[in-house]
């Protein structure tokens, strides 16, 4: 294929791939008709003047995962057709001025995972057609004003995983076509008002894992097209009342891992398209009425690992489309009988690791589609008659680690559990805590006559059509209907997958599917 170097493989489709530690310089001669060249995992340390001079038809050039630390300014001369250039995962500390001069067709420039200490306006001043610029994973401490002023067509800019401590309010002002801006994992403590005002087409803004303590009230007021806003793992202690007021297209908002103590009224709205709201790992202590009432399309609400001790009966007003509600690992002792009444489409609710002593009999009355209820590790001694009767789709019910009181009052629940054992899973079954003579025995197979020998057991109305079998052995083990795999953070749809962490630590999270939180 017009002379393929021995260290490389060349395909009919004009694709050349050169890999291996034996390679210490750009192989020659490269086929003149090459359109794609990949130089990966080599020991190349520098690019000299014009190594690609004879392959002017090149469209894509990937020089990744090498030892590259030095590039001559004219290294990419004569590559006027180049659209994609990646220098990611090398050891570049400095970019020579003029390096990208003449790359008039360049649309994607990947400089991520190097050791770049600074960028200057002159670096990108010739790249007027650039659509994507990846600078994440470097050592940038500041971005000078004007750095991106010539990149008016830029749609994606990633500055994540650097050491930025502040951002000038003017640095993004000319990026009117930008759709994705990622600033995650820096050291930003605040963002000046006006920083994002020019980004009228922004769809995704990633600010997670910084040290942001305060958000300016009008910070996002010009970003009417914003769909995904990631603010998790910062130091935000309060949200200005109007901060999210102009975000009608927002469908995902992550605020987990902050220091929020309260949710100010009207803070979320109107956001008619918001589907997911992640608020776990904050310091929220109570939920007032109507706090989410503008979120008519919300499907996932994660409030776990806060300090919630009080939920007002109208706290979930408006959440008619909610599917997943995570309230686990809070300080709940009581729930008003009306608190879930609006959640007609709820499928999964997690209430484990609270201090609930009892549940209202009608707590799930309007929530007929419930499929999974997590109630383990509370202070429940019994449950009201018929509490689950109408839940025909219920396939996962976790009741273990509660101090069940196995006297005659437990019979209706025990009988229902006998007939619905598969729903309890196989890992852990509920066991009696009292009286002392039956402590530790399975609630399902306990003989209540033994538990309270001195008391005549009256005829207790049981859950419908569930006869009492005093000595029935437990049913054969049945596989749990659904797993409790948990994501520690919502998958943030990154093509570069920089922040996705998946775990299956069920003991910590113990929730169902999308209830990550």
């Amino acid at each position: 294929y017009h002379g393929c170097p021995s260290e490389c493989t060349c395909s009919r489709a004009s694709q050349v791939e050169c890999t291996g530690a034996r390679i210490v310089a750009v192989p020659t001669p490269l086929p003149w008709n090459a359109m794609s060249l990949q130089i990966l995992n080599t020991h190349i340390t520098e690019l000299n003047e014009s190594p690609f001079l004879n392959i002017s038809a090149l469209i894509a050039l990937r020089i990744e995962k090498n030892e590259l630390s030095r590039i001559t300014p004219g290294a990419f001369r004569n590559l006027g057709s180049l659209r994609y250039l990646s220098l990611a995962n090398n050891k570049l500390q400095v970019l020579p001025i003029g390096l990208f001069q003449g790359l008039d067709s360049l649309e994607s420039l990947l400089l991520s995972s190097n050791q770049l200490l600074q960028i200057q306006p002159a670096h990108f001043s010739q790249c007027s057609n650039l659509k994507e610029l990846q600078l994440h994973g470097n050592h940038l401490e500041y971005i000078p004003d004007g750095a991106f002023d010539h990149l008016v067509g830029l749609t994606k800019l990633n500055l994540g995983k650097n050491s930025l401590t502040h951002i000038s309010p003017r640095v993004f002002q000319h990026l009117g076509n930008l759709q994705v801006l990622r600033l995650y994992e820096n050291r930003l403590t605040d963002i000046p008002m006006g920083t994002f005002d020019g980004l009228v087409n922004l769809q995704e803004l990633a600010l997670q894992q910084n040290q942001i303590g305060l958000l300016s009230p009008g910070l996002f007021h010009n970003n009417h097209n914003l769909q995904r806003l990631y603010l998790s793992n910062n130091h935000i202690s309060q949200l200005p009342p109007s901060v999210f007021m102009q975000l009608p297209q927002l469908n995902r908002l992550t605020l987990f891992g902050n220091s929020l103590k309260e949710l100010s009224p009207g803070i979320f709205g109107p956001m008619p398209n918001l589907r997911e709201l992640w608020l776990y790992d904050n310091h929220i202590s109570s939920l007032p009425d109507n706090v989410f009432s503008n979120l008519r399309q919300l499907q996932v609400l994660i409030l776990s690992r806060n300090q919630i001790s009080f939920i007002s009966p109208g706290a979930f007003n408006g959440l008619t489309e909610l599917r997943e509600l995570s309230l686990h690992t809070n300080a709940l002792q009581d729930l008003d009988g009306n608190v879930f009444r609006m959640l007609a489409n709820l499928q999964n609710i997690s209430l484990q690791n609270n201090r609930l002593r009892q549940l209202p009999g009608n707590i799930f009355a309007n929530v007929n589609g419930l499929m999974a209820i997590q109630l383990q590790n509370n202070q429940l001694e019994n449950l009201p008659l018929g509490i689950f009767d109408h839940l025909g789709k219920l396939c996962e019910l976790r009741l273990y680690d509660n101090p069940w009181r196995c006297d005659s009052d437990i019979l209706p629940l025990r009988n229902w559990l006998l007939l619905n054992q598969p729903r309890l899973g196989t890992d852990t079954v509920p066991v009696c805590f009292s009286p002392a003579n039956v402590r530790g025995q399975s609630l399902i197979i306990i003989n209540v006559n033994v538990a309270v020998p001195s008391v005549h057991v009256p005829e207790v109305p049981s859950y419908p059509e569930t006869p009492w079998y005093p000595d029935t052995p437990s049913y054969p083990d049945t596989t749990s209907v659904s797993s409790t795999t948990e994501l520690t953070s919502p998958v943030e749809d990154y093509t570069d997958l920089t922040t996705i962490q998946v775990t299956d630590d069920r003991s910590v999270w113990g929730m169902t599917q999308a209830q990550s939180g």
């Epitope: 009342p241 009224p265 009425d289 109208g314 009581d334 008003d336 009988g337 209202p360 009608n362």
Partner: antibody, heavy 118, light 107 residues
């Protein structure tokens, strides 16, 4: 239908205590918060606190902390509000009230007049 | 504590009049405001909740509006049975607080 029936009027001396009862019917007593609100003669309404009958948990307004105690008897579906160290400015009608679908007071007792006078 | 300032404290009106009562919260309470009607010797009666929703059985001449800090109760055409005292209440934050009341009297 939901009903809250309160005990009768009381006359107390300054420094004494008073215990007002509120008997609930028409719903599952243990499942809904019950509040106490008072109204001094010719004055406005003042929220005192709530009790959750299922657990006995309470929350009191800071103003009454240390002087008010709310309790319940689940066997009779009755909540009680006891106010101690009475002073003349505690003269008021005391209402029990239950929330509806939000933290507003949908159901009210008829009120109990407590007069504090030497 | 959140102060609820109600005005006017009293007003005189005739049957058929349009009456407007306002309530101003000292801080943002969202839409967590209720309005009550109280007649002498009786317990208050819920009229409006969540700032603008009529309680069941309440005539349509009663309406509420507002959000944040400014709220209004309107009686579009005053009827003889409407002469009473009206209270606003915020239930966004503890302690829940009431306005001072507005007494609507016959002119």
């Amino acid at each position: 239908q939901v009903q809250l029936v309160q005990s009768g009027a009381e006359v107390k001396k300054p420094g004494a205590s008073v215990k007002v009862s509120c008997k609930a019917s028409g719903y599952t007593f243990t499942d809904y918060y019950i509040n106490w609100v008072r109204q001094a003669p010719g004055q406005g309404l003042e929220w005192m606190g709530w009790i959750y009958p299922g657990s006995g948990n309470t929350k009191y307004a800071q103003k009454f902390q240390g002087r008010v105690t709310m309790t319940r008897d689940t066997s009779t579906s009755t909540v009680y509000m006891e106010l101690s160290s009475l002073r003349s400015e505690d003269t008021a009608v005391y209402y029990c009230a239950r929330w509806g679908y939000g933290a507003y007071f949908t159901y009210w007792g008829q009120g109990t007049l407590v007069t504090v006078s030497s | 504590d959140i102060q609820m300032t109600q005005s006017p404290s009293s007003l005189s009106a005739s049957v058929g009049d349009r009456v407007t009562i306002t309530c101003k919260a000292s801080q943002n309470v969202g839409i967590n405001v209720a309005w009550y009607q109280q007649k002498p010797g009786k317990a208050p009666k819920l009229l409006i909740y969540s700032a603008s929703y009529r309680s069941s059985g309440v005539p349509s001449r009663f309406s509420g509006s507002g959000s944040g800090t400014d709220f209004t109760l309107t009686i579009s055409s005053l009827q003889p049975e409407d002469f009473a005292t009206y209270y606003c209440q915020q239930y966004n934050a503890f302690p829940y607080t009431f306005g001072g009341g507005t007494k609507v009297e016959i002119k």
